[in-house]
């Protein structure tokens, strides 16, 4: 059973007193909330390019704009990893690169960006409207994913401009790290303001995730977020994806994320803020995630010394550092 988490909606402030004081009281919390919520939000960019020499050969470049250290990058096609997407490559800074056909060459370009070349022949080769997604797991920000595809009328050799992803999925480590501290600080500020002014302040509506279904797929975008951002998941042409691949589809391992509300990474603009969110450039889209899920007491996909908080779609010991069990 899959639950659909709602995007945390910012409630409009309750009617207040007229005049300058009333306006100031209303504006200040909004400004504070805006600063708090958007502070330090990382971004992921994705660039998809078709090679002029081989018309069915693609180069995908992805980068992470954040201050944390990257602990894993997963590149998938056909949608986000775990939500119908098939893993093409897993890049671990310490343990190397594991890639699956039709991926030909995955590489680290810099400390925070990677590139992946796809084969241009065979039944499993991509086509122009295939969607590619990059997920960066970093500490302390958590896990962030963005997706992109070629614009519909791309000329060979041209590429879609790098698409920054304004809101992406924050995972447990990020929530418990910097984001948690920020959020706590902001809530505390609002609490102080509220006590000081004796006036109701704007509040975050809790996500309406069903507590009875903690195993909802963490990578499936919610209906609410799809509707609000017009994310074209439904229009992905899957005919270009392999029907029968003998390569790995490393989505193994249970969902074990804690059920926590995430913070909105957009500038709040009142109740309609989500609907008016800027959409990425044509040919690209953003995966919006707003619920983190866990199965209480369930064993993580792999445990042992050196295990970090991030699960790895490829299964065994992906996140283990160089000092593993001997």
């Amino acid at each position: 059973m899959r639950t659909e988490a709602q995007v945390p909606a910012l409630q409009p402030p309750e009617p207040g007193l007229e005049g300058a004081m009333g306006h100031r009281t209303l504006v200040l919390p909004w400004v504070l909330l805006t600063l708090c919520v958007t502070a330090g939000t990382p971004e992921v960019w994705v660039q998809v390019r078709m090679e002029a020499t081989e018309l069915s050969s693609f180069t995908i470049r992805c980068g992470f704009l954040g201050s944390g250290s990257i602990s894993l990058v997963t590149v998938s096609w056909g949608g986000p990893n775990g939500a119908g997407g098939t893993t093409l490559a897993v890049l671990h800074p310490e343990r190397g690169i594991r890639q699956w056909a039709p991926a030909r060459q995955a590489r680290w370009e810099t400390q925070s960006s990677i590139s992946l070349i796809l084969e241009g022949s065979g039944a499993s080769s991509p086509c122009a409207n295939t969607t590619f997604c990059c997920k960066f797991a970093s500490f302390p920000e958590g896990s962030w994913e963005a997706c992109g595809s070629l614009p519909p009328s791309s000329d060979p050799g041209l590429s879609a401009p790098p698409t920054p992803a304004p809101i992406l999925r924050a995972d447990l480590a990020g929530i418990l790290g910097v984001s948690g501290v920020l959020l706590f600080g902001c809530v505390y500020l609002l609490h102080l303001l509220r006590r000081h002014k004796h006036r109701p302040a704007p509040r975050l509506q809790p996500s309406r995730t069903s507590p009875q279904a903690p195993r909802a797929r963490a990578w499936a975008p919610s209906q609410a977020s799809q509707a609000a951002l017009h994310v074209p998941y439904a229009t992905i042409n899957t005919s270009c994806r392999p029907a029968t691949l003998d390569t790995a589809h490393p989505h193994g391992g249970p969902s074990w994320w804690a059920s926590l509300p995430t913070h909105a990474a957009h500038r709040p603009q009142g109740p309609a803020a989500w609907a008016s969110t800027p959409i990425p450039a044509r040919g690209s889209f953003v995966s919006v995630e707003n619920g983190l899920y866990a199965q209480a007491g369930e064993r993580p996909p792999h445990t042992g010394p050196g295990l970090t908080l991030f699960p790895d779609p490829r299964g065994p010991r992906a996140m283990e550092g160089p000092l593993g069990v001997r």
Partner: antibody, heavy 120, light 113 residues
Framework: EVQLQQSGPELVKPGASVKISCKAS????????MNWVKQSHGKSLEWIGE????????NYSQKFRDKATLTVDKSSNIAFMELRSLTSEDSAVYFC?????????????WGQGTSVTVSS | DIVMTQSPSSLAMSVGQKVTMSCKSS????????????LAWYQQKPGQSPKLLVY???TRESGVPDRFIGGGSGTDFTLTISNVQPEDLADYFC?????????FGGGTKLEIK
């Protein structure tokens, strides 16, 4: 102590199939991919593919995609490799090798090898 | 796939001598993320399976004598045995462990005079 114990030598006829095994002990079998490597007589090493014992996911070298099938029996900590449509080119020693602790493909433990001879 | 080339194909040394063998890769094995070179060296004694000696170009596997020294960066790598012993008679293979598929060099056969 980590050990990979492979099945004994095989003499098979051209066109036939053979299934060789690799029993792992001394570590958590499902925590590391199992690799298979071919060594033709007096020659270098060729990577055939790998399998994730946790869920059976496989990853093959392009060259061996139609030749080898990798499987595991999680309950008994055994990895298998089946080779089909055998020809004299497939006569070689086949090794199973455990994924490294420090790196995916720095293989830190190897089986003793299984010799496969294809002859009519 | 990354192509690995080893040289020489064989060499004969006397006990106590220092030996250096070379390995070249068709593309850089340096990981831009952490500046590690993903190159491994294996020793295969006659009738035995390969044994991991060195990984990340210069990190010795536990239990490997310190006379085995890995070096190099990018595309050019070396394995040096500083004080050759009779038990070092073996084939030595380099292998890139940067990405799938891992590929091996043709090997260097070390013979003891």
């Amino acid at each position: 102590e980590v050990q990979l114990q492979q099945s004994g030598p095989e003499l098979v006829k051209p066109g036939a199939s053979v299934k060789i095994s690799c029993k792992a002990s001394g570590y958590m079998f499902t925590d590391y991919y199992m690799n298979w490597v071919k060594q033709s007589h007096g020659k270098s090493l060729e990577w055939i593919g790998e399998i994730n014992p946790n869920n059976g996911d496989t990853n093959y070298s392009q060259k061996f995609r139609d030749k080898a099938t990798l499987t595991v029996d999680k309950s008994s900590n055994i990895a298998f490799m089946e080779l089909r449509s055998l020809t004299s080119e497939d006569s070689a020693v086949y090794f199973c090798a455990k994924e490294g602790v420090s790196s995916y493909y720095a293989m830190d433990y190897w089986g003793q090898g299984t010799s496969v001879t294809v002859s009519s | 796939d990354i192509v690995m080339t080893q040289s020489p194909s064989s060499l004969a040394m006397s006990v106590g001598q220092k030996v250096t063998m070379s390995c070249k890769s068709s593309q850089s094995l340096l990981n831009s993320n952490n500046q590690k070179n993903f190159l491994a060296w294996y020793q295969q004694k006659p009738g035995q399976s390969p044994k991991l000696l060195v990984y990340f170009a210069s990190t010795r596997e536990s239990g490997v004598p310190d006379r085995f020294i890995g070096g190099g960066s990018g595309t050019d790598f070396t394995l040096t045995i500083s004080n050759v012993q009779p038990e070092d008679l073996a084939d030595y293979f380099c292998q890139q462990h940067y990405s799938t598929p891992p590929t091996f060099g043709g090997g260097t056969k070390l013979e003891i005079k």
